[in-house]
Interface confidence: low
């Protein structure tokens, strides 16, 4: 009932709590002398369902039969209406519509760890929409029954606070949960289990790993478990992998040897436990142990390449380059590279350790036969040396690959193709494709890139260190024994018209013709490989079309003669540059007047 109901009563039959689909009778009756003062027969009783009128009646009482009430709570209020006054609230009632509880399903109990307590969970079934109380019973040895009630609105979990112990691991326990509300009750099917069935071990802890003699091949994983654990499963993976290796072990007693770990790799290890071969459940996985395996001496061999540069008649500069070993080959942190340079006939050798670089430059005599060996060293040893005889890589003209082309292949890739050399193609042992950013002046500090290609290949896709709008000098070497031939080409992955034209820095007169000199366009403004320069000129005050001279681009060229100017005429000259994508804007304009005699 709601409020004080001083003026009358509302009664509900058969009950304030009804089963969904039931009918209720609601009666509103005024107490004596609580009607309208002057005209009691004018009493108008009105029944509201929430805020909506559903019935009214003149007199001292009102009866209403109500059906079709929804699940949940519905509020009915009875009011009195008298002439010339507001409605007065008489009384009200809440009706609770629900269902009897369904049978709880899937009752299961667990004890987390040998020192834990028994807790049970179940599925309640559909909502009853009524206050429902759950009672959990646990019966066991010595005719004991434990019982615990749960008064949460949505109760599907209870912890007994009982610690089952393994004194009699085969003793049976029976759990049952009963749900009760105003409309009925229902009990789950009983769940019978033993200690071994429900104790879920705590995950192993204090996980450690030991490498005997700092060797990855002698590795033991140690952990601590609860006393009754019989089975363990181990899973481990490199930290950068998603796939686990799994191992099942019985009676491990907190240790297991791992034989297949890779050196110098960070691994993640986890362990789970179980008390019985076929009873009970696995523990959660332990916390992860992350540990790095020890180094082993490197395997594999370095990929080494070199460049030769003529210095003078007696000396040459050798630049060696090598690629880092892969992680799986390095098998540790590479501390240094050992480079040995040897003159083969005289036997003189010099060895140097290089740290922090993957290149080395030295100057050697142009005479003699030279060889180098390069190896990588970590804390455990060195890789097998890569040996290379220094030769003139482009000396054998007949070994030069033919018809070399370089074409853009998608974003930041260049496809290099070639034809085998004229000389017996079967003599080729491998091709090397080398590329570096084109820098006027042939800067030897520019990083060198290369890849090796099998002798039957006639193309290679280069993508490493390729940037858009940069021109690359690409060489294809054919190697055969201690001979090599090469061909070169310029290529870019993406190009557009240069951003500026060359800057004319001088015009000089020589025997009736002129020599124009210019500064190269800055590399970042070339926007790809330059194909041509154009020199334009016209008479200073003329509106005629300029004349032009187109010069094929050569890296080292920065001057060109023109001999078609008339003497004593002032000309305006300028230059542009072209890539395959188009022509640049004008460079600077220079005026010049040829002083020579007229023909």
């Amino acid at each position: 009932k709601i409020d004080a109901c001083k003026r009358g009563d509302v009664t509900v039959k058969p009950s304030h709590v009804i089963l969904l689909g039931s009918t209720v009778n609601i009666t509103c009756s005024l107490k004596p002398r609580q009607g309208c003062f002057h005209y009691s027969r004018r009493n108008k009783l009105i029944l509201y369902k929430f805020d909506r009128r559903i019935n009214f009646h003149h007199g001292h009482s009102l009866n209403s039969q109500v059906t079709g009430l929804p699940l949940g709570t519905t509020l009915f209020v009875c009011k009195l209406a008298c002439i010339n006054s507001d409605e007065i609230q008489i009384c009200g009632a809440e009706i609770f519509v629900g269902v009897a509880p369904e049978q709880p399903q899937n009752l299961s109990c667990i004890q987390k760890g040998e020192q834990g307590t028994v807790a049970c969970t179940w599925e309640r079934g559909r909502d009853t929409h009524l206050y429902t109380e759950y009672t959990l019973q646990l019966s066991g040895p010595k005719n004991l029954t434990w019982q615990k009630q749960c008064k949460d609105i949505y109760c599907d979990y209870l912890d007994f606070g009982i610690n089952l112990t393994p004194e009699s691991p085969e003793s049976n326990f029976t759990a049952k949960v009963t749900a009760v509300n105003s409309l009925g009750s229902s009990s789950s099917l009983p769940s019978t289990f033993t200690f071994l069935d429900i104790v879920r071990p705590l995950p192993p802890w204090d996980i450690r790993i030991k490498f005997q003699k700092a060797s990855v091949s002698r590795c033991t994983l140690y952990w601590r478990d609860e006393g009754l654990v019989l089975l363990n499963r181990l899973r481990y993976r490199p930290s950068n992998s998603r796939l686990w290796n799994m191992v099942n072990v019985t009676k491990a007693k907190g240790r297991h040897d791992l034989l297949d770990l890779k050196p110098f790799t960070e691994y993640e290890f986890q362990i789970s436990s179980k008390l019985h071969l076929y009873k009970g459940s696995w523990s959660d996985w332990s916390e992860s142990l992350r540990a790095q395996t020890p180094e082993e001496e490197p395997t594999g061999m370095l990929d080494v390449w070199y460049m030769k540069r003529h210095i003078d008649y007696s000396r040459q500069q050798i630049s060696l380059f090598w690629k880092n070993l892969s992680v799986s080959e390095a098998r540790g942190k590479i501390l240094h590279y050992q480079v040995t340079l040897q003159e083969l006939t005289g036997g003189k050798a010099m060895t140097q350790n290089i740290t922090g670089h993957t290149s080395w430059t030295t100057v050697i005599p142009r005479t003699g036969n030279w060889a180098v060996a390069v190896s990588a060293a970590n804390s455990k040893g060195s890789s097998l040396p890569t040996r290379i005889n220094i030769m003139n890589l482009c000396e054998a003209g007949l070994l030069a690959p033919r018809q070399v082309s370089a074409n853009s292949e998608g974003m930041d890739n260049i496809l290099v193709t070639w034809q085998p050399p004229r000389k017996d193609p079967s003599a080729v042992q491998e091709y090397v494709v080398e590329w570096r950013e084109l820098h006027p002046g042939g800067d030897t500090q520019v990083p060198l890139n290369w890849l090796r290609s099998r002798p039957y290949n006639v193309s290679a896709l280069i993508s490493e260190n390729i940037k858009s709008y940069i021109c690359y000098e690409i060489r294809v070497y054919a190697l055969s024994g201690d001979q090599g031939g090469c061909s070169s080409i310029l290529g870019n992955s993406k190009h557009k018209a240069p951003l500026s034209g060359p800057h004319i820095n001088a015009i000089t007169e020589e025997k009736g013709s002129i020599l124009i000199s210019w500064n190269s366009i800055p590399v970042q403004e070339q926007m790809g490989c330059l194909l041509h320069y154009r020199i334009y000129w016209k008479e200073r005050d003329s509106n005629s079309q300029p004349q032009l001279c187109e010069i094929p681009y050569r890296v080292s060229q920065n001057s060109h003669p023109i001999n078609s100017l008339q003497p004593r005429v002032t000309y305006v000259l300028w230059m542009t540059a072209l890539t395959a994508a188009g022509e640049s804007s004008h460079g600077n304009e220079r005026e010049f007047c040829l002083q020579g005699k007229a023909n």
């Epitope: 802890w205 204090d206 996980i207 450690r208 790993i209 332990s286 916390e287 992860s288 142990l289 992350r290 540990a291 790095q292």
Partner: nanobody, 129 residues
Amino acid sequence: QVQLQESGGGLVQAGDSLRLSCAASGRTFDTYIVGWFRQAPGKEREFVSALSWSDDTTIRDDSLRGRFTISRDNAKNTVYLLMNSLKPEDTAVYYCAAKAKPPAATWSSYRNREWYDYWGQGTQVTVSS
């Protein structure tokens, strides 16, 4: 051998901030785990936060709801604990602890006070309401 010296404690009002310092002498922190713990009167020493110097890993107790931040200054060989929105229940002696970083550690090692080898004398923090 590492000697640890905490400083920066004192009496503050609830809601204030404080920065504690832990300076090492004897050797640098670069191969150490450095942890902050606190011990309120009559209670056990509890973990607050920790930092692994070499790989910049930090570990914190989330019950502090992000109010405390651990940081470091390489040049000064010092670890700091910045404490914001202080509450009276933060009143405690705050200790700095250190351990040489092992090749492998389990997830909860850093929280375990028995795990640390070196301890400072502590600095008192009192938060008044």
